[in-house]
Amino acid sequence: LEETLLNTKLETADLKWVTFPQVDGQWEELSGLDEEQHSVRTYEVCDVQRAPGQAHWLRTGWVPRRGAVHVYATLRFTMLECLSLPRAGRSCKETFTVFYYESDADTATALTPAWMENPYIKVDTVAAEHLTRKRPGAEATGKVNVKTLRLGPLSKAGFYLAFQDQGACMALLSLHLFYKKCAQLTVNLTRFPETVPRELVVPVAGSCVVDAVPAPGPSPSLYCREDGQWAEQPVTGCSCAPGFEAAEGNTKCRACAQGTFKPLSGEGSCQPCPANSHSNTIGSAVCQCRVGYFRARTDPRGAPCTTPPSAPRSVVSRLNGSSLHLEWSAPLESGGREDLTYALRCRECRPGGSCAPCGGDLTFDPGPRDLVEPWVVVRGLRPDFTYTFEVTALNGVSSLATGPVPFEPVNVTTDREVPPAVSDIRVTRSSPSSLSLAWAVPRAPSGAVLDYEVKYHEKGAEGPSSVRFLKTSENRAELRGLKRGASYLVQVRARSEAGYGPFGQEHHSQTQLDESEGWREQLA
């Protein structure tokens, strides 16, 4: 990018530059006509018969450098060929010299600085590539010479450019003074400001475009070269913020449209909102869940919105004494999630009718909550109680939902309590063929013992056919028809209105070997 400091082609008024010395044959400001037939202000000098060593100087007005360290001067000029000038002396030249002088203000006068090299700084001696000679008629009078020179380094507020003629017949058609700067550049969502190079290469820090954030790593920078070009170099730049995507060749971040989102900064484009979510505004980093749908705290921002599951179905209960096995089917609606678990709530009602949450004497296997499989075993049920179990299905968003959690209930009533096991059996009399037994009356919680069942078999004879039963209404019994000198295993259970209680521990008894021993009371 070039920034113009002076362009005589654009000047319409007289330039009124300073010449030295004030003599005939000096530089003269004239109107000219360029290749495009535009009128331009020019300076011409044509003193080809001067005395050797006599110089004609022309100096521009003061030009502020506007921060430029190196300034370029493009000169367009024509020059007559010495050979085609019959009266040209040996001092005729086809070159001229360019100088500059720096100052902090427009302080030069007609006589100062002294018109010589040092204080003026020589830039170059310029030779014409194309020489003008007389042409027939209206032919082009000769090609224009174009030369670009480099001034600097400059340090003061401004400068003058000066031209020294020592015997040429030439016209300065235009002077363009400019400096080069690296144009504002946006690359990889990073904006690099317009920069005037102060050295061969200058590092320039970039800043993220609107709605972009710096990428991790070193902050982005580019190098501005002295020729006004950015040095090619990969840029780790910036990336669009959440809710924005790169656009227009990675020079802008554009807000995600309604119905789309972008959850993270970085590359990638806006995506349609996931299931059960929406974005009603532009620039959404996250889509809002529809009413009744949620995202768990651990869900990614781009995850679909989900809802709590429906209730489990078809709870089946199998009561076994004080144990209960519950089993159910998965809910019809999982809510769109995989993290399904089950939990149970329990209420118990006493036979009298008062109800309360289940006490701590119940145990749940594997547990009352966080169940992964659709079953549970409940132990420690009390007899003659009615239990209500509510089975709920839960997932990762159940805790976010308000309102009642759907459940599938099941009611289970336990049997009334049977008598406890009869364990303290005594042998009161023994003979070779019989045994008389007695036991303590068990305390039956649900009414009196109605009768007892005695179960016995010879030791070693384990099959079902060898087991014999005897019912008695008293808390004693006589076992007859036994083998002589044999060992028997005896168990007793009591029956109340609630049913039979469990058999007690096996009691070991032995019959007599012969009659002479008679009845003998045996204590267990």
Epitope: L30, G32, L33, T78, L80, P86, G137, A138, T141, C169
Partner: antibody
């Protein structure tokens, strides 16, 4: 503004010569084209020839070839037109005119004449 | 020499009229054609050069066009001071030539 001042009116005999001068005041002279144009009474303009002083030699209209000589003196910024073997039909007003641009400051030599002298009446009569 | 033929040789017009004068060259002269205005007893005045370039200080009602052999000078709205003789002038050759002139008179 440059002025071209021509010499005064002349009365000449047929067969004689006349030399009309044209002095340019102020500024560059050598690189402009100076043309000579005549106008007989009640007639149109007639180009006779032109010179770019720095180059020395002049171009002439075929009609006047051999009879007219155009010269320039750079030191005095004066151009001259000499017409010989005068005839009565050479009675006319003779103008000098300068081109709009120098040979160095225009890309094409349009020889457009934007500065004219006041004219010199030359009468050829026996 | 290249011959320049102007037409018409004279014309009558009123103030405000649009006036067109043509000039034809005997051979191609590209755009190397100038137009002049001359009033009685005065030196000619340059109006247009390079076929269409308006000389500085000349009113914009004057315009020129053409290239090659056919050229036109147009006065878009004739003013009282425009009554004069108009000449075309070719500079393509080493030998310049003028047209014979067109006299613009008051109707």
């Amino acid at each position: 503004q440059v002025q071209l001042v021509q010499s005064g009116a002349e009365v000449k005999k047929p067969g004689s010569s006349v030399k009309v001068s044209c002095k340019a005041s102020g500024g560059t002279f050598s690189t402009y084209a100076i043309s000579w144009v005549r106008q007989a009474p009640g007639q149109g303009l007639e180009w006779m020839g032109s010179i770019i002083p720095i180059f020395g030699d002049a171009d002439y209209a075929q009609k006047f070839q051999g009879r007219v000589t155009i010269t320039a003196d750079e030191s005095t910024s004066t151009a001259y037109m000499e017409l010989s073997s005068l005839r009565s039909e050479d009675t006319a007003v003779y103008y000098c005119a300068r081109s709009s641009y120098t040979i160095l400051t225009t890309y094409y030599n349009y020889n457009a004449m934007d500065n004219w002298g006041q004219g010199t009446l030359v009468t050829v009569s026996s | 020499d290249i011959q320049m033929t102007q037409s018409p040789s004279s014309l009558s017009a009123s103030v405000g009229d649009r006036v067109t004068i043509t000039c034809r060259a005997s051979q191609n002269i590209n755009n190397f054609l100038n137009w002049y205005q001359q009033k009685p007893g005065k030196a000619p005045k340059l109006l247009i050069y390079g076929s269409s370039i308006l000389q500085s200080g000349v009113p914009s009602r004057f315009s020129g066009s053409g290239s090659g052999t056919d050229f036109t000078l147009t006065i878009s709205s004739l003013q009282p001071e425009d009554f004069a003789v108009y000449y075309c002038h070719q500079v393509s050759d080493t030998s310049d030539t003028f047209g014979q002139g067109t006299k613009v008179e008051i109707k």
